[in-house]
């Protein structure tokens, strides 16, 4: 019998200073590139070693980015979201959603559209 897998969702404001090589992360998602079923949100898919985000330490792979400098990322095309980050300036404020897996009992099966696991 599978145990229940619960998720603890928290939000955090992360202020990054753009480094010599930029912010130092990759994203997936957007209205034209939904990776998570029924969710066109923007997700962090890679934190680059020694980049600004990695050195700050708070942003994690799998985090959902809700806004950049107060601008909502809902219903954006993937490239429009990318451009928003690239044009965000030197000091960048990110509102992010962390989704932590909390395991109860035996390991449950992860659904295809589930971004965690």
């Amino acid at each position: 019998m599978n145990g229940r897998v619960d998720y603890l969702v928290t939000e955090e404001e992360i202020n990054l200073t753009r480094g010599p090589s930029g912010l130092g992360f990759n994203i997936v998602g957007g209205t034209d590139q939904q990776y998570v079923s029924n969710d066109s949100g923007i997700y962090v898919s890679r934190i680059k070693e020694n980049g600004a985000a990695a050195l700050d330490g708070r942003l994690q792979e799998g985090d959902k980015i809700l806004s950049v400098n107060g601008q909502d990322l809902k219903n954006l095309l993937h490239q429009d979201a990318v451009d928003l980050f690239r044009n965000a300036g030197y000091a960048v404020s990110l509102r992010v959603q962390h989704r932590l897996q909390v395991q109860n009992g035996p390991i449950g099966h992860r659904g295809e559209g589930d971004p965690s696991g």
Partner: nanobody
């Protein structure tokens, strides 16, 4: 973190075929489908070199000139596995073959391809020996 385990290597005669597999164990909160995957190889006394790569979505594949037309990289996200099918093997294909992974998607800083650099996670390798 991502743990990578390669298999499928072995001894094969020139002209033969091998299919290498790499299974990824992905940490909680992450998913295999977000990772670009690559194969590299290192022959005795030589530097490690790029062989092939596939983007996180599977939509883009890249090959070194030395294996182009003889090898196919593919992935099965449901099985957390990437494959390298190698045909018409030559003695010069003899090497330890390594699987590598890195988060895919688009850099928020600059455009770059899925090719030969910036991999974050590496397997232990599987030996491929091609005899005359």
């Amino acid at each position: 973190d991502v743990q990578l385990v390669e298999s499928g290597g072995g001894l094969v005669q020139a002209g033969g075929s091998l299919r290498l597999s790499c299974v990824a164990s992905v940490a909680s909160g992450r998913t295999f489908g977000w990772y670009d995957m690559g194969w590299f190889r290192q022959a005795p006394g030589k530097e490690r070199e790029f062989v092939a790569a596939i983007s996180w979505s599977g939509g883009s594949t890249y090959y070194a000139d030395s294996v182009k037309g003889r090898s196919t990289i593919s992935r099965d996200n449901a099985k957390n596995t990437v494959y390298l099918q190698m045909n018409s093997l030559k003695p010069e294909d003899t090497a330890v073959y390594y699987c590598a992974a890195r988060g895919g998607g688009t850099s928020v800083d600059s455009d770059y391809d899925v090719g030969e650099f910036e991999y974050d996670y590496w397997g232990q390798g599987t030996q491929v020996t091609v005899s005359e």
